[in-house]
């Protein structure tokens, strides 16, 4: 009951962190500044991974993609494929954790499987949170170098003056938004891969043995072969190993009353 | 890199007018802001006026009710309509473009200035 609870939970924490991540990178509110300020209107801009936005005290508002721009930062588009690593990733990671929902029954899908595909989605979860906390950590880095770099400076360009603008800017709320996201994918991943540990099956079978007593009437108890099930006699899984033992592909069966499969 | 061409400017009798005009050409991203401010012999640069991107548009005290500016958003051009000079209008012209960069901080593009003498 617990590990169908953690399971389940780990889920359902994993879907809001990943739509959190899809909602934060189709966000526009990446970062944010003032652009413009006088006594009359402020121009208020607000940019994301795929568009920059402005907009007016007066209401006026006008969105630009970067397509247009040729020299975007290379950051940006780290920043781009991490986000989407991270969708990508935690899309396939959902879809396979639906299948290894242990209250879903498709099938007849063993334990071990649900297991494997349980702790497949867990790691996948992982890596997705992972790529969007990065990703959202380079953006906020490449901001605060940005502007340290673009502080008030004047030179010469062609035709007069340019100066850099000192303007006060904000991270924005998706930021945020990405960084509690990839948090919660993180966490519902590692509840995966927790709820995984208890799906397991508990007993290890191995291949099965046949045991052929050596001209003594002495039955050997194959109870070692099986873990901790307190199976037989042997109960402190000590094998119990005769020379004359052999896998069931290497014995040719005859019929004998020593023999114990 | 943004190249501003300014024009318009020269010698006008007082309560006379005058129409400045200042074209932005390069490659950049998006202007924010165009606006003019003057620079009188011996003074500092002040503001004249100045639109925005949406059409608003700022006054300074010493020319409002006397001058328009207005803006064509598709040519990035500004031009600055000034109407009953005076004397004490005798100034260097300088046009301003404030340019959007993406993920820096803006940049303000300067011309070179057209000078307007107002005398009789």
């Known amino acids: 009951m617990a590990v169908t609870a953690c399971q389940g939970l780990g889920f359902v924490v994993s879907l809001i962190g990943i739509a959190g991540i899809i909602a934060a990178t189709c966000m526009d509110q990446w970062s944010t500044q003032d652009l413009y300020n006088n006594p009359v209107t402020a121009v208020f801009n607000y940019q994301g991974l795929w568009r920059s936005c402005v907009r007016e005290s007066s209401g006026f508002t006008e969105c630009r993609g970067y397509f247009t721009l040729l020299g975007l930062p290379a950051m940006l588009q780290a920043v781009r494929a991490l986000m989407i690593v991270g969708i990508v990733l935690g899309a396939i990671g959902l879809l396979v954790s639906i299948f290894a929902l242990k209250c879903i029954r498709i099938g007849s899908m063993e334990d071990s499987a649900k297991a494997n595909m349980t702790l497949t989605s867990g790691i996948m979860f992982i890596v997705s949170g992972l790529c969007a906390i990065a990703g959202v950590s380079v953006f906020a880095n490449m901001l605060v170098t940005n502007f340290w770099m673009s502080t008030a400076n004047m030179y010469t360009g062609m035709g007069g003056m340019v100066q850099t603008v000192q303007t006060r800017y904000t991270f924005g709320a998706a930021l945020f938004v990405g960084w509690v996201a990839g948090g919660l994918t993180l966490i519902g991943g590692v509840m995966m891969c927790i709820a995984c540990r208890g799906l397991a099956p508990e007993e290890t079978n191995y291949k099965a043995v046949s045991y052929h007593a050596s001209g003594h009437s002495v039955a050997y108890k194959p109870g070692g072969f099986k873990a901790s099930t307190g199976f037989g006699s042997n109960t402190k899984n000590k094998k119990i190993y005769d020379g004359g033992a052999r896998t069931e592909d290497e014995v040719q069966s005859y019929p004998s009353k020593h023999d114990y499969v | 890199e943004v190249q501003l061409v300014e024009s318009g400017g020269g010698l006008v009798q007082p309560g006379g007018s005058l129409r400045l005009s200042c074209a932005a050409s390069?490659?950049?991203?998006?202007?924010?802001?165009m606006g003019w401010y003057r620079q009188a012999p011996g003074k500092g640069r002040e503001l004249v006026a100045t639109i925005t991107r949406g059409g608003s548009t700022y006054y300074a005290d010493s020319m409002k009710g006397r001058s328009t500016i207005s803006r064509d958003n598709a040519k990035n051009t500004v031009y600055l309509q000034m109407n009953s000079l005076k004397p004490e209008d005798t100034a260097v012209y300088y046009c301003?473009?404030?340019?959007?960069?993406?993920?820096?901080?803006?940049?303000?593009?300067w011309g070179q200035g057209t000078l307007v003498t107002v005398s009789s």
């Open positions: 390069g490659s950049f991203f998006r202007i924010v802001a």
């Open positions: 301003n473009v404030r340019v959007e960069v993406p993920f820096m901080a803006p940049n303000d593009y």
